[in-house]
């Protein structure tokens, strides 16, 4: 096609995970899939400076057709910010990843004590639950609501009924996953909420309760509801 176009990202989902916490000796791959016309070129920076092969033992691989940078057997000195710069004569775009190389003994995720905290709000109000997670390896985080089916919290197998409200795994590391927002709260939103964090060693979770109170001035309306009439 003759339509000239500045560089653009073709698969932002593959770029959502900005923070990569990787055990020493593992392989790291950063991708910046892009398009443009003419086809853009890609170069990599480490901590804002040109990234050269001699900057690390064993060098690195660039797979231009996959828009990727690959570093094998990472070591602590590989920690830092890696920026892909994709450019053609019509423009330039860039994206930065942060690499942390983990040498500690990996442990199951640790959740900050007291979080999430119990909360209460009135009908129509907003509430947020916060969960702070510390994990050597990238954790996968879920927010879970304990729900009822046919008036029961537990199934015939004795297991609780659960609904995953929000989840993040390999493609997401945004801090927003650590906060669960509930807008325009209803009575049905009351109950137990669980923040679950897992990694390759195990799973940890903390729970909190949401109490929903009638909105001020609505008591009459609630009392007059047909559900309460004989």
């Amino acid at each position: 096609s003759n339509n000239k176009r500045a560089p653009y990202w073709t698969n932002t989902e593959k770029m959502e995970k900005r923070l990569h916490a990787v055990p020493a000796a593992n392989t790291v791959k950063f991708r910046c899939p892009a398009g443009g016309n003419p086809m853009p070129t890609m170069r990599w920076l480490k901590n804002g400076k040109e990234f050269k092969q001699e900057h690390r033992i064993g060098g690195y691989k660039v797979r231009n057709q996959h828009w990727s940078l690959i570093m094998e057997s990472v070591v602590p000195s590989d920690k830092g910010n890696y920026t892909c710069v994709v450019e053609n004569e019509y423009g330039s775009i860039n994206h930065t990843y942060h690499l942390d190389v983990v040498e500690r003994s990996p442990h199951r995720p640790i959740l900050q004590a007291g979080l999430p905290a119990n909360a209460s709000t009135v009908v129509g109000g907003d509430v947020e639950f916060v969960c702070k997670v510390y994990s050597d390896a990238q954790p996968h985080i879920q927010w879970i609501k304990h729900v009822e089916k046919n008036g029961s919290k537990y199934g015939p197998d004795g297991l609780p009924y659960l609904k995953v409200l929000k989840a993040a795994g390999v493609n997401t590391t945004d801090k927003e996953i650590e906060v669960l927002y509930i807008r325009n709260v209803t009575f049905e939103d009351a109950g137990e909420y669980t923040c679950l964090a897992g990694n390759s060693i195990g799973i940890s979770f903390h729970s909190a309760w949401l109490t929903v109170l009638p909105a001020p001035g609505r008591e009459k309306e609630i009392t007059a509801s047909p559900d309460y009439l004989e």
């Epitope: 003994s105 442990h107 199951r108 390759s200 060693i201 195990g202 799973i203």
Partner: antibody
């Protein structure tokens, strides 16, 4: 039925290589971390390695670091252990063990399901 | 690494009598989520280990209620209230809080 079946064991000379496999069935393999644990003849249990559910994280015991590589193929429900530069002290039964899942667990979060094991003998 | 020390090395028990195995960890296994990550296994001759107790005191499904786990932080105990012939084998404790996961040296239980 949840099952793990190891294969690939055998007799090998010191310095040579061997690749173990573990076929998983009866559960969603791609949602679980997986481990290798070994047991030398007449001895206790020794943890060898773990791989996360998606293969992005791997950890090894110091005794095998740099020689063994754990990997997985979620499309084939298979866990592998590539063992290079084998030593006499690597002689053991190697067990494949299911680790933690990705979601809420009502019960143990892993180390509940073990394979029958495959024997590796390193001898000259 | 967390060291798991198990005692005794072996135990000879009369059927119907109680038995107790101790395990000590070099660091606390009490996690921030309030759980204590010690597991107990029984390995019968020629078989892989089978899970008995998880998270200190929870019996795994299908495990008879004569098995119980207790303890806190660094000191743990597995009790068999009335030993039966099928309980013979080697018992192991394991810490499941950090890698490398580590096991106790094992306690061999036999019937008198």
């Amino acid at each position: 039925e949840v099952q793990l079946l190891e294969s690939g064991g055998g007799v090998v000379q010191p310095g040579r290589s061997l690749r173990l496999s573990c076929a998983a069935s009866g559960f969603t393999f791609s949602s679980y971390a997986m481990h290798w644990v070994r047991q030398a003849p007449g001895k206790g249990l020794e943890w060898v390695a773990v791989i996360s559910y998606d293969g992005s994280n791997k950890y090894y015991a110091d005794s095998v670091k740099g020689r063994f590589t754990i990997s997985r193929d979620n499309s084939k429900n298979t866990l592998s252990l590539q063992m290079n530069s084998l030593r006499v002290e690597d002689t053991a039964i190697y067990y494949c063990v299911r680790g933690a899942g990705r979601g809420y667990t009502y019960g143990p979060d892993g180390f509940d399901i073990w394979g029958q094991g495959t024997m590796v003998t390193v001898s000259s | 690494d967390i060291v798991m020390t198990q005692t005794p090395l072996s135990l000879s028990v009369t059927p119907g009598q109680p038995a107790s195995i101790s395990c000590t960890s070099s660091r606390s296994l009490l996690h921030s989520d309030g759980k204590t990550y010690v597991y107990w296994y029984l390995q019968k001759s020629g078989q892989p280990p089978q899970l008995l107790i998880y998270e200190l005191s929870n019996r795994f499904s299908g495990v008879p209620d004569r098995f119980s786990g207790s303890g806190s932080r660094t000191d743990f105990t597995l009790k068999i209230s009335r030993v039966e012939a099928e309980d013979v084998g080697v018992y192991y404790c394991m810490q499941y809080i950090e890698a490398p996961l580590t096991f106790g040296g094992g306690t061999k239980v036999e019937i008198k």
